[in-house]
């Protein structure tokens, strides 16, 4: 089943994926689309990147994080209620069959009406963010997205990258989980 | 320490061509992207494109294709900007810069004049 | 293409005074890939800040950057006479890649 992201009007919605590049000089193409993973590709791009860059996108849809490095989160600004759904990211490992793909539910609730200021979440991720290697744990807790032959040190810089950033405070308010194996 | 070493200025007739270098230095040439950019006097920069000298692989602004041709000689560290049918739009100053753009060539002058 | 627009194009700041340069982007781009650079007549650009905010080898810490998605700014905490140049910011993660027409920072 896919994994559940939430977000309100008007907000930025964030859609996380992550794989581990083999070479700096080597990326593999990523491809965003709205709607499940079909066998191949990904249906209705948002978003592409190639060897080196984000070769298509459409506005309000982008990569905030170091795609360089293996982040390839999609962000999506200024939600609304038709943003609702399932989106497919799609690690286009070479090779035949060897593509990862990720299915993830954007799920956008209305705005809230808020009597008084309150700290705004500009993104927000319903359910806990969980790292897994390939292959281990059940498929709804693979929410980061393909890390093929990640090693413990890898993990774990990723999880100090992960309280260091932006998102510390959210991901600290949603219980963000680093699960190994 | 990291350098990037361009030719000097080039005072060419209209309708030539050109081949601007750039030689690097202090770091493993195959390795890392060259961008080129372009500078028009008083104006702001334009990339051109980069090659990755591992590959030969090349990316151009669309603005570019047909005006510029990358190249690289990996034997001597050499990155190589090939600029046809010149006209005075091309008269400009070229950076070569590095990777991630955290180095820049010096800069090479081309005035297109009759 | 992406357009990165800056603003203001020209502006003079007295010594000791607060400066913000913005450089605005017509969709969103990698706050990894968005950079500053600092430019003086007959010289080559100099990367100023790197990754929206990391200065530099050698900038001085009066100068930070910050921002996101597409809206990214620069700031000069007290301009001081050296900090006269034409400042640029640049996106390299969107193809092909991008430069703001500038900004001419003059002293008073």
């Known amino acids: 089943s896919e994994v559940e992201y939430r977000a309100e009007v008007g907000q930025n919605a964030y859609l996380p994926c992550f794989y581990t590049p083999a070479a700096p000089g080597n990326l593999v193409p990523v491809c965003w689309g709205k709607g499940a993973c079909p066998v191949f590709e990904c249906g209705n791009v948002v978003l592409r990147t190639d060897e080196r860059d984000v070769n298509y996108w459409t506005s309000r849809y982008w990569l905030n994080g170091d795609f360089r490095k293996g982040d390839v989160s999609l962000t999506i600004e200024n939600v609304t209620l038709a943003d609702s759904g399932i989106y497919c990211c799609r690690i286009q490992i070479p090779g035949i069959m060897n593509d990862e793909k990720f299915n993830l539910k954007l799920v956008i609730k209305p705005a809230k009406v808020t009597p008084a200021p309150t700290r705004q979440r500009d993104f927000t991720a319903a359910f806990p963010r969980m790292l897994t290697t390939r292959g281990h744990g059940p498929a709804e807790t693979q929410t980061l997205g393909s890390l093929p032959d990640i090693n413990l040190t890898q993990i774990s810089t990723l999880a100090n990258e992960l309280r260091d950033s932006r998102l510390a405070n959210d991901l600290r308010d949603s219980g963000a989980t680093i699960r190994i194996g | 320490q990291i350098q990037l070493q361009q030719s000097g200025p080039e005072l060419v007739t209209p309708g030539t061509s050109v081949k601007i270098s750039c030689k690097a230095s202090g770091y493993t040439f195959t390795d890392y992207y060259i961008n080129w950019v372009k500078q028009r006097p008083g104006q702001g920069l334009e990339w051109i494109g980069w090659i990755y000298p591992g590959s030969g692989n090349t990316k151009y602004n669309e603005k570019f294709k047909g005006k510029a041709t990358l190249t690289v000689d990996t034997s001597s560290s050499i990155a190589y900007m090939h600029l046809s049918s010149l006209t005075s739009e091309d008269s400009a100053v070229y950076f070569c810069a590095g990777d991630r753009f955290d180095y820049w060539g010096q800069g090479t002058t081309l005035t297109v004049s009759s | 293409q992406i357009v990165l627009t800056q603003s203001p194009a020209i502006m003079s700041a007295s010594p000791g005074e607060k400066v913000t340069l913005t450089c605005s982007a017509s969709s969103g781009v990698s706050s990894s890939y968005l950079y500053w650079y600092q430019q003086k007549p007959g010289s080559s650009p100099k990367l100023w800040i790197y990754?929206?905010?990391n200065l530099a080898s050698g900038v001085p810490a009066r100068f930070s950057g910050s921002g996101s998605g597409t809206s990214y700014s620069l700031t000069i905490s007290n301009m001081e006479t050296e900090d006269a140049a034409s400042y640029f910011c640049?996106?390299?993660?969107?193809?092909?890649?991008?430069f703001g027409g500038g900004t001419k920072l003059e002293i008073k």
């Open positions: 640049h996106q390299w993660s969107n193809s092909p890649y991008t």
């Open positions: 990754s929206t905010s």
